[in-house]
């Protein structure tokens, strides 16, 4: 004959543990149903009702099965520096991250504390690596043969366009100019672009462990050093 | 007790750079962040960036990314702000603060502790 | 960038009298973390500014409970309960909520 199914509230056999969507009420001493994402346990269950659930207020969620008194309230409002890339609903919370252009410079237990516009490399400088979600970007000098023209934070250096007879030649701000005859190659004409990073921090993240060499503080999400400012400008 | 204490007084010619250092002591370096802080003569104070002592991450003021630098020597716990070409409108006091805002919980996230100031006059 | 605007600029008070300076920013300073990182600071004639009031209305260690900050959002408040001489100097709001880090003009308090 197959095992009868229990029905919530239940004593567990000794020993055992309840099941799937289920906890241990330690007052009852009984298995008893837990409540679903985007509700809490308005009335705890007894050795003869079942837990009683309701479904949050506003501006409040539980992301998981639960059997907590009261919803979590969803955070702050986002910063002007910073975009809402998912909304509070009864079942997840708020997540910030900072607006297109910017990075996190400074990122802790909440979220990203410090947004910072993204590094932009002057004329005579490329993009050597693109900013991040949590890194800036960073600038080299344009190497003999290529340059930039532009004050970007995507636009990397380009090779000189290669004429028959050089007008002006090159530098590393500004492209050969060739005279009237046309050139035997030529870049695609406009800026290349990197691509923009996608934020996806959640303004809840939880903590990276401490490397070994960190002070006793609590502390933040560590990011990678930051390279000199050289090549870079402000707007 | 927790102390900044700054380098002193600098007289600089237009297109020259300076460096100002400031010296931590009194407390764990790492555990800090350190603003720069500038007042010119009679003047209201201006942010000039700051940098992340744990891991040397930089921001500066946009009107001064081009010239400015932030660096710190953890084995002295000392930090640097170098302002390169400068200016007659650079003349000021340049202050180095404390930015209580790397640890998690209890923090001020404010500029706690300032060092004595370090006069930059920019004169031909 | 967020503007702090503080008033009045200049504030002659009678020794043992309250004193109010008023600081608005352009902008709520209110933190996706929940918190409103506003803060008051205290500079003395010929000396480095000195941190008073952090997060609104935190007073820091060793400032006199006579100091105390209030407000909300964009509209901030430090009072000083009874002016005494030694509180002559510029009093400054400044907002660590957000990149660039900026400054209110800063208000003068002087004795009548």
């Known amino acids: 004959l197959p095992a009868q199914v229990a029905f919530t509230p239940y004593a567990p056999e000794p020993g055992s543990t309840c099941r799937l969507r289920e906890y241990y009420d330690q007052t009852a001493q009984m298995c008893c149903s837990k409540c679903s994402p985007g509700q809490h346990a308005k009335v705890f269950c007894t050795k003869t009702s079942d837990t009683v659930c309701d479904s949050c207020e506003d501006s409040t969620y539980t992301q998981l099965w639960n059997w907590v008194p009261e919803c979590l309230s969803c955070g702050s409002r986002c910063s002007s520096d910073q975009v809402e890339t998912q909304a509070c609903t009864r079942e997840q919370n708020r997540i910030c991250t900072c607006r297109p252009g910017w990075y996190c410079a400074l990122s802790k237990q909440e979220g990203c504390r410090l947004c910072a516009p993204l590094r932009k490399c002057r004329p005579g400088f490329g993009v050597a690596r693109p900013g991040t979600e949590t890194s800036d970007v960073v600038c080299k000098p344009c190497a003999p043969g290529t340059f930039s023209n532009t004050t970007s934070s995507t636009d990397i250096c380009r090779p000189h366009q290669i004429c028959n007879v050089v007008a002006i030649p090159g530098n590393a701000s500004m492209d050969a100019v060739c005279t009237s005859t046309s050139p035997t190659r030529s870049m695609a004409p406009g800026a290349v672009h990197l691509p923009q990073p996608v934020s996806t921090r959640s303004q809840h993240t939880q903590p990276t462990p401490e490397p070994s060499t960190a002070p006793s503080t609590s502390f933040l999400l560590p990011m990678g050093p930051s390279p000199p400012a050289e090549g870079s400008t402000g707007d | 007790q927790v102390q900044l204490v700054q380098s002193g007084a600098e007289v600089k010619k237009p297109g020259a750079s300076v460096k100002v250092s400031c010296k931590a002591s009194g407390y764990t370096f790492l555990s800090y962040g350190l603003s720069w802080v500038r007042q010119a003569p009679g003047q209201g104070l201006e942010w000039m960036g700051w940098?992340?002592?744990?891991?040397?991450?930089?921001n500066y003021a946009q009107n001064l990314q081009d010239r400015v630098t932030m660096t710190t020597d953890t084995s002295t716990s000392t930090a640097y702000m170098e302002l390169r070409s400068l200016r007659s409108d650079d003349m000021a006091v340049y202050y180095c603060?404390?930015?209580?805002?790397?640890?998690?919980?209890?923090?001020?996230?404010?500029?706690?502790?300032w060092g004595q100031g370090t006069m930059v006059t920019v004169s031909s | 960038d967020i503007v702090m605007t503080q008033t009045p600029l200049s504030s002659p008070v009678t020794l043992g009298q309250p004193a109010s300076i008023s600081c608005r920013s352009s902008q709520s300073l209110v933190h996706s973390d929940g918190n409103t990182y506003l803060n008051w600071l205290q500079q003395r004639p010929g000396q480095p500014p000195r941190l008073l009031i952090y997060?609104?209305?935190n007073r820091f260690s060793g400032v006199p409970d006579r100091f105390s900050g209030s407000g909300a959002g964009t509209d901030f408040t430090l009072k000083i309960s009874r002016v005494e001489a030694e509180d002559v100097g510029v009093y400054y709001c400044t907002q660590t909520t957000q990149f660039p880090i900026t400054f209110g003009q800063g208000t003068r308090l002087e004795i009548k």
């Open positions: 603060a404390r930015w209580d805002i790397l640890t998690a919980y209890y923090s001020s996230d404010a500029f706690d502790i």
């Open positions: 940098i992340n002592a744990y891991n040397g991450n930089t």
């Open positions: 997060k609104v209305s």
